[in-house]
């Protein structure tokens, strides 16, 4: 066995959303770090057979199965997969290693099956069996995590009932506003389920699984920041637990903290009362009130209030159901060529939005900011100066909505022309739609200044790219027109761009461009 | 870090079926691929069932096709192989067995990141 090559298999997870079949070759994708899959000898198999540990993809993904061979020479080699040959093309790394890879883009029911490798070297010749299954998914969920307290102690459990089971953390921040956000220095995580620290500014607790990750925020007013403007408000489902948490520091320990609901105060047992000292010696008290499982009376204006501080309130809005509130009616856009534009949405939903941009059948990533006023908003740069119908789609669990864009650019026809045995055609897509003029070149009109009355017939159609219009123009070719030389000119505000097309028998037409 | 401890192993005749588990310590129990291999006396460790991180899927050895069933219960950090139909063949101390990824299911040793310390499985009559 001292002979045998030292091989390694690895698998190459792609983040890309580009579409084909398997493509032995090496693609450019951006990718995860290879993870091993344990190439083993095959035991009791004729001839020599290493053998991959199987490996799981979701639909969609796009993954390489890849072999690193540590053998002196040239190889060759040659994929089999359902009986069919794949083409294969070794190559060597700085390490000198011989490297084979076979790239699955967009991974379908039809891709999963066993994918052989036979390798030749000069010393010996072995198998690699690779095995591909389709991730089940059917049963996941990933539902936002909630908090409940903790049995005989000051402490809160972030709990998240997911499938498969989530990793919980918890994200703090004890800094105010940007510097809160996810990669900042000032964030800490801790990926326990318990936290008993409750005195920070931001926490939020977060759960992830392979369907992404859903953050939950605890609701705090704070009794020495200077109010909104507008009245915090929470929204909840029935059935849903309601936290929210009261913080006031003040010099000494003087002072204390009450909730209210509508001008009454809370029951026993739904409110509990932190405190602790500063570094600077001030004191901190927190008040939790919470209800374990929220009903409609539980509706109204929650108003935490101290004896050394003006008091605040929040209101706590419970509904039967999701929503999403928003203008659907569809909005269009006229922009000059480089000038610098966002769509963008603003809406107010429960529980959290998902959310994607469209264009041209292409999915973007959407982001949502919240606002000071209880609104959300998102907004979509990544355009490209792309003229198009651009689509803004979002989800709850309860409720959808789209909203539909239309963006023009502003812009000087540009004309192509074509030509058959009975007419010429000529279509623009500049920016407002351009009109049309045909002209005819003879000794009489060498500049081709002689108008084209009759025979013209203008269109306006839906091109490929979803929701951008173009406009043509068709001249009906009379038998006197053969032979000679006519100009189709398209203009709009921006400007003129013409063709110029010889009406000869069928057959290719020469097309002289003229701006 | 996992630990895992298996147990249910023991003698059993011919055609019988016997239970394994295999319980796991650990937070994130459902993050990892887990399996079951055997090794029979001189012989070398070899696959035997293993089922994905989330139990959506599951994969056995041709040997055992049709009469073993991996299973788990992620709420319970405990892995299972039910085992009937049991032959002579069957003989050898089960070891289970843990990945460190979700994509990579665990069919060959190689893979595996954590073992544990195996339990004694006899069919005899």
């Known amino acids: 066995n001292q002979d045998l090559p030292v091989i390694k298999c690895v698998l190459i997870n792609h983040k890309n959303n580009d579409s084909s079949v398997g493509k032995s070759s090496s693609y450019p994708m951006v990718s995860e770090s290879p993870e091993d899959l344990g190439c083993a000898l095959r035991p009791q198999s004729a001839g020599t057979v290493y053998e991959a540990a199987t490996v799981e993809v979701d639909v969609s993904a796009s993954i390489t199965l890849q072999v690193l061979v540590d053998t002196p020479g040239n190889i060759s080699c040659l994929w089999v997969f359902k009986h069919s040959s794949l083409n294969c093309q070794p190559h060597f790394d700085v390490q000198n290693r011989g490297v084979v890879s076979m790239v699955i883009l967009k991974m379908t029911e039809t891709q999963a099956g066993e994918y052989l490798l036979f390798i030749q070297s000069e010393a010996t010749n072995y198998t690699i069996v690779f095995t591909v299954s389709i991730r089940n998914t059917l049963l996941f969920t990933l539902r936002r995590p909630y908090f409940r307290k903790m049995e005989n102690q000051d402490a809160l459990v972030c709990i998240s009932e997911s499938v498969p089971e989530p990793i919980v953390e918890w994200v703090l921040c004890d800094s105010q506003g940007e510097s809160c956000k996810e990669e900042s220095p000032a964030v800490v995580k801790k990926e326990e389920k318990v936290l008993h620290e409750l005195f920070g500014t931001d926490i939020r607790c977060c759960a992830r699984n392979e369907l992404g990750r859903e953050c939950t925020r605890l609701f705090t007013i704070d009794l020495n920041q200077t109010p909104q403007t507008t009245l915090p408000q929470l929204f909840l489902k029935v059935g849903e637990p309601l936290w929210i948490r009261c913080k006031a520091v003040h010099v000494n320990h003087g002072f204390g903290l009450t909730w209210e609901l509508e001008n009454k105060a809370l029951e026993e047992g739904s409110y509990f009362e932190m405190s602790t000292y500063s570094t600077n010696r001030t004191m901190i008290r927190i008040l939790f009130a919470f209800v374990s499982s929220v009903a409609r009376n539980d509706t109204g204006y929650y108003t935490c209030s101290s004896s050394k501080h003006p008091s605040q309130s929040a209101l706590v809005t419970i509904v039967e159901k999701g929503f999403i509130n928003a203008t659907n009616s569809s909005e269009d856009y006229e922009i000059d060529q480089y000038e610098e534009f966002c769509f963008s949405v603003r809406f107010k939903a429960y529980p959290q939005i998902r959310c994607t941009w469209t264009f041209s059948r292409k999915a973007f990533p959407c982001e949502q900011k919240a606002l000071d006023d209880g609104y959300s908003v998102s907004k979509f740069c990544n355009h490209k100066h792309q003229p198009g119908e651009y689509i803004f789609h979002a989800e709850n669990g309860d409720a959808q909505f789209t909203k539909m864009f239309t963006l023009n650019i502003r812009r000087k026809p540009q004309v192509l022309a074509e030509a058959s045995a009975s007419q010429a055609s000529c279509s623009s897509d500049g920016y407002p739609l351009p009109s049309w003029t045909w002209k005819k070149c003879s000794d009489k009109s060498p500049n081709c200044t002689e108008d084209i009355p009759e025979g013209v017939w203008n269109r306006k159609a839906n091109r490929k790219v979803f929701g951008q219009w173009v406009s043509s123009s068709t001249l009906n070719m009379s038998e006197a027109m053969k032979g000679f030389l006519v100009k189709c000119c398209a203009y709009n505000s921006l400007g003129t761009s013409c063709e110029t097309i010889l009406l000869n028998s069928p057959g290719p037409f020469p097309f002289i461009q003229d701006s | 870090e996992v630990q895992l401890l298996e147990s249910g192993g023991g003698l059993v005749q011919p055609g019988g079926s016997l239970t394994l588990s295999c319980a796991a310590s650990g937070r994130t129990f459902s993050s990892y691929a887990l399996g079951w291999f055997r090794q029979a006396p001189g012989k070398e460790r070899e696959f035997v069932a293993a089922?994905?991180?989330?139990?959506?899927?599951?994969y056995y050895a041709d040997s055992v096709k049709g009469r073993f069933t991996i299973s788990r219960d992620n709420s319970k950090n405990t892995l299972y192989l039910q085992m009937n139909s049991l032959r002579a063949e069957d003989t050898a101390v089960y070891y289970c067995a843990a990945g460190g990824s979700t994509r990579v299911v665990v069919t060959t040793t190689p893979v595996v990141k954590y073992w544990g310390q195996g339990t004694l499985v006899t069919v005899s009559s």
């Open positions: 089922i994905s991180w989330s139990g959506g899927n599951t």
